[in-house]
Amino acid sequence: VPRWRQQWSGPGTTKRFPETVLARCVKYTEIHPEMRHVDCQSVWDAFKGAFISKHPCNITEEDYQPLMKLGTQTVPCNKILLWSRIKDLAHQFTQVQRDMFTLEDTLLGYLADDLTWCGEFNTSKINYQSCPDWRKDCSNNPVSVFWKTVSRRFAEAACDVVHVMLNGSRSKIFDKNSTFGSVEVHNLQPEKVQTLEAWVIHGGREDSRDLCQDPTIKELESIISKRNIQFSCKNIYRPDKFLQCVKNPEDSSCTSEI
């Protein structure tokens, strides 16, 4: 008789999840010499241990602590790029501007990027059928708690001038409910971070509006200022240049300082 299985509203664990995490870990540690000491089997064991046999709505940050410890990594704290609702462009940017880092350029972010996972209470099985949706089911699910944990740590590590890339094409350029708005903004350390500089990416060259005047940007400015961190905002009108440089990263026109 088939055992009853909880049906969640979200997609199930990404197929070949264990193999993908392990392969990504091996690839990352080969490319990044400073992480060569990492034992990828231990990383996978710690990752698995965070959610296997646990109810997928009762995951805590503590569950991920062994993984966090194994994935401890130092990135230049003054070269951090946060992003909200514009992941692809942020990643394309750091692929070319190699001295800046998004969360997904770190080992833990790289391992989990675009993946979904969850287990089942009291069984060692991975649930490939469905996983909890953050809105419809529960917020303390394995994926959400993971990103909340690593995002908090990433923001806490930042110093000096921190940049955030925001999508000027969205109705809410700054969204309080995004990971950036709900986690990262509140975990920047005022004693270390001098300024948060927002880059508002326009949809195209013909859009000449000052999106730094957007009410949601003013809201972000207010939140940041109350935390005793300076805020600045720049309109970025040339996403076409990003894309040109992604295609031709060796072009000398793609190496300007920020």
């Epitope: 070319v96 880059w199 060259r205 013909e206 905002c233 309109n235 026109s253 300007s256 920020i258």
Partner: antibody, heavy 121, light 105 residues
Framework: QVQLVESGGGLVQPGGSLRLSCAAS????????MNWVRQAPGKGLEWVSG????????YYADSVKGRFTISRDNSKNTLYLQMNSLRAEDTAVYYC??????????????WGQGTLVTVSS | DIELTQPPSVSVAPGQTARISCSGD??????VSWYQQKPGQAPVLVIY???NRPSGIPERFSGSNSGNTATLTISGTQAEDEADYYC????????FGGGTKLTVL
């Protein structure tokens, strides 16, 4: 080293046409967007027109839209500005300028020496 | 389009600090570059992205930008710094300020 050399300027009557050229050397021409900036005698700088690295996108100041056409030939490392229906107010030194600042910001790191266009009857 | 306004002229004694302003509505929301132009010559980029100096430009040139004003500062001004200075920004089209004539007394 980067070199931009403009040519094709001269005296032309109102309503006439002129074609400016800018020969580029010392860098990979096809990697850079290029622009024309002009300066009327005794006046400030005014951006005229720009073109993307492969020529697929062109941009114009309102004052020249419909009259000027920017183009480039990457095989010849040359930038062009075809100027039609010229007016007295188009009289200026025309500079060819390389657009730099790939991601976040746009500026002109290299300029030619300029070529003078005089529109007068 | 943003409008950039510069004072027509600024005077400074040699060795003193010259400050050239470039004002515009919320200009701090845009990156600003500065160009130096000497008579009969093409402009030369001296500051880009608000405060960055291209290689070959002396350290005495610096820039800042916030609120409604961007500023080019020349510390320990030298006679050779006498020139016209233009600020420039971008909001889908390139915009230049009207220029400032710097006179070294």
């Amino acid at each position: 080293q980067v070199q931009l050399v403009e040519s094709g300027g001269g005296l032309v009557q109102p309503g006439g046409s002129l074609r400016l050229s800018c020969a580029a050397s010392g860098f990979t021409f096809s990697s850079y967007a290029m622009n024309w900036v002009r300066q009327a005698p005794g006046k400030g700088l005014e951006w005229v027109s720009g073109i993307s690295s492969w020529g697929s996108s062109t941009y114009y100041a309102d004052s020249v839209k419909g009259r000027f056409t920017i183009s480039r030939d990457n095989s010849k490392n040359t930038l062009y500005l075809q100027m039609n229906s010229l007016r007295a107010e188009d009289t200026a030194v025309y500079y060819c300028a390389r657009e730099d600042g790939s991601y976040m910001t746009d500026y002109f790191a290299y300029w030619g020496q300029g070529t003078l266009v005089t529109v007068s009857s | 389009d943003i409008e950039l306004t510069q004072p027509p002229s600024v005077s400074v004694a040699p060795g003193q600090t010259a400050r050239i302003s470039c004002s515009g509505d919320n200009i701090g929301h845009y990156y600003v570059s500065w160009y130096q132009q000497k008579p009969g010559q093409a402009p030369v980029l001296v500051i880009y992205s608000d405060s960055n100096r291209p290689s070959g430009i002396p350290e005495r040139f610096s820039g800042s930008n916030s609120g409604n004003t961007a500023t080019l500062t020349i510390s320990g001004t030298q006679a050779e710094d006498e020139a016209d200075y233009y600020c420039q920004s971008y909001n889908g089209t390139y915009v230049f300020g009207g220029g400032t004539k710097l006179t070294v007394l």
